[in-house]
Amino acid sequence: GITIPRNPGCPNSEDKNFPRTVMVNLNIHNRNTNTNPKRSSDYYNRSTSPWNLHRNEDPERYPSVIWEAKCRHLGCINADGNVDYHMNSVPIQQEILVLRREPPHCPNSFRLEKILVSVGCTCVTPIVHHVA
Amino acid sequence: GITIPRNPGCPNSEDKNFPRTVMVNLNIHNRNTNTNPKRSSDYYNRSTSPWNLHRNEDPERYPSVIWEAKCRHLGCINADGNVDYHMNSVPIQQEILVLRREPPHCPNSFRLEKILVSVGCTCVTPIVHHVA
C-alpha cells in the first residue's frame, strides 16, 4: 500500500479512523476509452461452456441492476455440439464493490458492500477422487 | 426497478440532479455469507482456456489492487493437453465500479469510475469469415 500525500484542496475531514465516511461523486467517469472492438458480448453463446444472463434488480443497491451468468449445462459442448459430461461448465465468480443505501431508502447515504457475482462460465477438467 | 420512499432519517440533500455527491461509509460489509465451497480458485489452471492473474495496483483507486486475467494461449487445451488453435481462448470481461480519488491524493473525496476488467477466460468457437 502506498501513502497518499494530502492535497491541500481536499474537503476537510476530522475523523481519519476506520470506519470512515467519504464523499463520492456519482457522476460516473468511464475509463473504457471507446468501446473495445475485441470485446464481444456473444461469448455466452459461442463458449464451450455457454451461459445465460439473469437480471438481478435491487433498488437499495448501486448499481441497481446486475446481470448474472448461469451456466447452461453441467458439462461442456464438444466438437459435435453435444454436451460432454467428462468436462464441467463452472461459473467464473468475482467479488465486486457496490453501494448499499444506509439507512435504507436514503438517496444520498451509502455503505460499501462486497458481493460475489458470476460473470461467465469456463470449461474445466473435473477433479477425480480415486477411492483406494 | 423500484423507487425509494425517502427515509426521514436520511442525511439532508437538496439537489437530486446528476451529478450528485453522496456520503459513503467505507467500512465494507461482506454479503458473501461464508466462502462458497463451490467457488474454486484453481479454475485458472484447470480450464481448457487457462489464464494467469496479473496484479494491477493504483493508489489513487479504491480498491487499489485488482487482479486481472490474461489468457495463456490463443487456442484452447484439448483432451490430449495440447493447444487446439481451431478454438479460441478469450477473456470474459466485466465493467465494475471503483472509487477514484478526486481531487487526486485526497483521502476522503472520490468519484465513481467504471473500468473494464478481465475476470477469467472461456473457450469459444471462432467466427469464420468466408471470402467469396
Epitope: 468501446t35 448501486y62 | 426497478g1 465493467e95
Partner: antibody, heavy 121, light 106 residues
C-alpha cells in the same frame, strides 16, 4: 440532448416478422437498458422485455412465448426488437424506452417516438 | 401477474378542479410510477418512485400511497393536464401497467 429515434411504420402479413430499430444518442448507451413497450390501437401499455447493451442480457415477458427477440449493437448505439409469427393482434405502436442501470428508481425516463406496425392480409 | 386497476377509467373535470386518480394493485408492490400520454404522442414519465415528480412536471401534481393503493393528485387542473394517465409497477415480472385514466374537459 437525449434522443431515442425509432424506425418508420411497417405493414406486414400474418406469419411474417418485423424488426424495429431504436437509435440512441445524447448519453452513454451502455449505462442504460432498453425496454420495449407496445400499445394496441385505443388500448393500454404492455411491457415486452428488456436488453442490457453492456452484457447482452435479455429478459422477456413470457406472454410473447419466444416470438420476441431484443438485441443491441453497441457500435451504433442502436437497439432492435424483432417480433415473429405476426398475427392481427400484434397491430400496435411499439416504443423503446431507456432505463438507468445504476439507479433504477428513475424508471423509464425517455421514450422513442413509437413505430406503428400493422399486421394485415 | 400483478394487475393494476385504475379508477376511474375516464373523468370529466373543469379547469381549477382538484382531481384524484387511484391505482389499485392485486398484490402489494414497493412503489408506483405514473406516465402521462397525449393522443398520438409517446408516454412521458410523470411521477416516479411513488412520490417524485419528473423534471418539468408542475408542483400541482403529487403522488402518494403504499402497499396496494396509490394515488395521483392534481391540486388545480390546468388545460395542459388533459391527457391519459397510466400507473405502472416494476416490483414483479412481468412489469404491468394500469388500463389508463382518460382526463377530459367538462
Amino acid at each position: 440532448e437525449v434522443q431515442l429515434v425509432q424506425s418508420g411504420a411497417e405493414v406486414k402479413k400474418p406469419g411474417s416478422s418485423v424488426k424495429v430499430s431504436c437509435k440512441a444518442s445524447g448519453y452513454t448507451f451502455t449505462d442504460y437498458e432498453i425496454h420495449w413497450v407496445r400499445q394496441a390501437p385505443g388500448q393500454g401499455l404492455e411491457w415486452m422485455g428488456v436488453n442490457d447493451p453492456e452484457s447482452g442480457g435479455t429478459f422477456y415477458n413470457q406472454k410473447f412465448d419466444g416470438r420476441v427477440t431484443i438485441t443491441a449493437d453497441k457500435s451504433t448505439s442502436t437497439a432492435y426488437m424483432e417480433l415473429s409469427s405476426l398475427r392481427s393482434e400484434d397491430t400496435a405502436v411499439y416504443y423503446c424506452a431507456r432505463y438507468y442501470r445504476y439507479e433504477s428508481f428513475y424508471g423509464m425516463d425517455y421514450w422513442g417516438q413509437g413505430t406503428t406496425v400493422t399486421v394485415s392480409s | 401477474d400483478i394487475q393494476l386497476t385504475q379508477s376511474p377509467s375516464s373523468l370529466s373535470a373543469s379547469v381549477g378542479d382538484r382531481v384524484t386518480i387511484t391505482c389499485s394493485a392485486s398484490s402489494s408492490i414497493s412503489y408506483i410510477y405514473w406516465f402521462q400520454q397525449k393522443p398520438g404522442k409517446s408516454p412521458k414519465r410523470w411521477i416516479y418512485a411513488t412520490f417524485e415528480l419528473a423534471s418539468g412536471v408542475p408542483s400541482r401534481f403529487s403522488g402518494s400511497g403504499s402497499g396496494t393503493d396509490y394515488t395521483l393528485t392534481i391540486s388545480s387542473l390546468q388545460p395542459e393536464d388533459f391527457a391519459t394517465y397510466y400507473c405502472h409497477q416494476r416490483s414483479s415480472y412481468p412489469w404491468t401497467f394500469g388500463q389508463g385514466t382518460k382526463l377530459e374537459i367538462k
